[in-house]
Structure formats: C-alpha cells, structure tokens
C-alpha cells in the first residue's frame, strides 16, 4: 500500500539520517580533538616565543652594554697611544738634555 | 490507525534527526574553521619561534665575539700600561743619572 | 733609529682608488697609535684620520667614507676610495694619538688630475 | 663636531718681540691641545703637548697655556728662525681631531 510504501521509504530517510548524523559526530569529535592538539600546540608555541623574545631582549641589551665597554677600552687604548707618545717626547728630551750636559 | 501513528513517530524522528544533523553541520562548520584558525596562527607562531632563534643565535655568537674582543682589549690595555710604566721608569732613572752626572 | 716614512707620490686620475703606505723603522705599532695628515698646496694642514695600536680606526668627519686606514705589523695604509682633484695634496704619516704626533714623514705629494 | 679657530692668521714681529697666538675649540677638550710649527718644504714639529708641555728639544722661549676652549701659545724674545706657520690641533673625548686654520709668523 501507499502508506507501507512511504513508511519504507521514512525509515530509509531515517536510516540514512541517523547514519549521517554519526558520520558527523564522529567527524566532529575529530576536528575537535584536531582543535584542541591545535590550540595545545598553539599556547606552546606563544610560551616558546615569550620564552625566546625575554631571552633575546636580554641578548640585545647584553651586547649593547659589550659595544660600550668595547667603544670605551677602545677609547682607552688610544689615550694610552697619546700618553706613550707624550712620555717618548719628554723621553728625548731628557736624553737631548744629558747629551748637552 | 497503528500504522498513521507510527508514521507520525516516525516524522517526528526524522524531523529531529534532521535538527540534529544540522546542528551537528553548524558545529563542524564552526569546529572546522576554529581549527584553521589554530592552525594558521600556531604555522606563524612556529615561524616567528625559527625567526627569534635565528636572531637569537646570532645575538649569542655576537656576544660571544664581543666578549672575546673585550679580552682582547682589556690585555692592550694592561700591556699599555706596563708598557707607560717602564717607560716612566726609564725616563726616572735617566733622570737621575743626569743629576748624578 | 726611530722613523716613519711615506711611499712615493704618484700622479692619479680622479675616480681612480689610491693606497698610500706609511712604512715604520724603530719602534713597534703594537704600542703605538698612527695618523694621516694632509696638506694642500699653500694651505694648511688637515687631520684625516687615526689607528691606534690595536687596531681602532678614528676619521674626521669630512673625511669618513673617502678614505680607509689599515695596518699591518711594520706598515699603516691609507686608501683614497675615490679621488677627487680637491685630494691632491702632501700626505704625512705621523705617530701617536690624540693631539699628540712626535714622529713624523717627510710627506709625499699625490696629484689627481686627469 | 669639533671646530679649532686660530688667530690671528698672519703676523709680523721684529727680533725679541713677544708674539701670542690664540686657539679657541668649539667644546671643552680638557688640555688635549698640542702647537707645531712648520717651516716651508718640511713636516710640522711639535712644540708643545698636552696644552702646556713642552716637547724634546724646543726652546723654552715658547710657552703654551690655556684649558678648556681656550689655549695660547706665547714665544717670548723671538728669533729669526721661529719664522714659521703655527699650528693648534685639538681632540675631543670622541678622538675628532681638528687643525687651527695656521698663524703665519713673519719676522721684520
């Protein structure tokens, strides 16, 4: 009869929803355990760079304070090249005074 | 009849299976592009992680070559000055000579 | 003896990159600090610039750029990147530091024309 | 920048005449302030270091003062051969080191 008929054809609608339905529940539990290993990964990563960022910060004022301890002993060295030259010109001329003595 | 109020049941069924299936579509839709979004921002944290070592690693081997030029200064330094001293002492003692002389 | 003394002078094109050399008797550039000074003809002198004894390079400001100043054990150089005719001039080598130049070449004169 | 101002630039002085040189830097160089003297065809020689010591073998007529940005150099009795262009050459902390534009001293 019509009704057999439609009923048969409602149960394999049915059936066919019901079976999408936990195709999709499965497909979501895996896009959500996806998500979540995502976001897991993601938070590691951002500590990773926090991490990262404050040591190269570190790294960064650390050869800031190298370059002027550098700049100042390279300072430091050519105030002695002057102060070496100054002693060798009294030098000589202590020696030139002896020599006339 | 049994048969209309099956059929009704059976309606109702599929009516909230079909419900179901699209709140379950809606979810994964909106589960689906979380994770994109996850995704995508833990590839560019991921970036950002090489990029920071990178730069990282390369403030470390210039700490590590300022330090060693530091060293290396910090002897001209005390070797110029050893160096200023003898020469002080030279010209003290020429001195004295020439006063003894 | 203690001296220091200038290569010989040479005649340039302008553009054409020139090394002069400064060459040391008697004493050593590990303990002491080396300049080159400039003198056009009948003006005054110019400081171009200086190294010290490790290494440390120092130029006048007009000078940074135009001119490289590099040492090896027994010899300091002076390198013109790119002459210019305002660049003929004597070019004295000296040694010390600061304001300080006891020892110093007799000069060497360069002449950039073309 | 440093800037060394010299004067005067040219002067004439007849033999046992007092002649003073000024130099004024555009900064305080806290006495790194050396004068020379140059004669023509030579390199220049140094007098004075350290804006009043004088150098090897330079006669004690010439005399060199002054501190901060001002500095003299003074020759007291002068001879005929302190005829010669003058010099200051200044340096700062930073080692910028700048030539006064020359004194040319003439003797009468």
């Known amino acids: 009869t019509a009704n057999s008929v439609a009923c048969r054809d409602g149960l394999r609608a049915q059936a066919e929803c019901r079976n999408t339905t936990h195709l999709l529940q499965r497909q979501l539990t895996r896009t959500q355990d996806s998500l979540l290993q995502a976001e897991t990964q993601a938070n590691s990563c951002n500590l990773t760079v926090v991490t990262l960022q404050e040591s190269l910060e570190k790294k960064v004022s650390q050869a800031l304070e190298q370059q002027a301890r550098i700049k100042e002993l390279e300072n430091e060295v050519t105030k002695l090249n002057q102060e070496l030259e100054n002693l060798r010109i009294q030098k000589e001329t202590s020696s030139t005074v002896q020599v006339n003595s | 009849t049994a048969n209309s109020v099956a059929c009704r049941d059976g309606l109702r069924a599929q009516a909230e299976c079909r419900n179901t299936t699209h709140l379950l579509q809606r979810q994964l839709t909106r589960t689906q592009d979380s994770l994109l979004q996850a995704e995508t921002q833990a590839n560019s944290c991921n970036l950002t992680v090489v990029t920071l070592q990178e730069s990282l690693e390369k403030k470390v081997s210039q700490a590590l070559e300022q330090q060693a030029r530091i060293k290396e200064l910090e002897n001209e330094v005390t070797k110029l000055n050893q160096e200023l001293e003898n020469l002080r002492i030279q010209k003290e003692t020429s001195s004295t000579v020439q006063v003894n002389s | 003896a203690q001296s220091v003394k200038e290569s010989e002078g040479r005649l340039v094109t302008p553009g054409t990159p020139l090394t002069l050399t400064c060459t040391v008797s008697g004493f050593s550039l590990s303990n002491s600090g080396m300049s080159w000074v400039r003198q056009a003809p009948g003006k005054g002198l110019e400081w171009i610039g200086l190294?010290?004894?490790?290494?440390t390079t120092y130029y006048a400001s007009w000078a940074k750029g135009r001119f490289t100043i590099s040492k090896t054990s027994t010899t300091v150089e002076l390198k013109i990147t790119s002459p210019t005719t305002e660049d003929t001039a004597t070019y004295f080598c000296a040694r010390g530091a600061g304001s300080s130049y006891g020892l110093w070449g007799q000069g060497t004169l360069v002449t950039v024309s073309s | 920048e440093l800037v060394m101002t010299q004067t005067p630039s040219s002067t004439s002085t007849a033999v046992g005449d007092t002649v003073t040189i000024k130099c004024q830097a555009s900064q305080s160089i806290g006495s790194n302030l050396a004068w020379y003297q140059q004669k023509p065809g030579q390199p220049p020689k140094i007098l004075i270091y350290s804006a009043s010591n004088l150098a090897s073998g330079v006669p004690s007529r010439f005399k060199g003062s002054g501190s901060g940005t001002e500095y003299t150099l003074t020759i007291s009795g002068v001879q005929r051969e302190d005829a010669a262009t003058y010099y200051c050459l200044g340096s700062d902390s930073s080692w910028d080191t700048v030539f006064g534009g020359g004194t040319e001293l003439e003797i009468l």
């Open positions: 190294i010290n004894s490790y290494g």
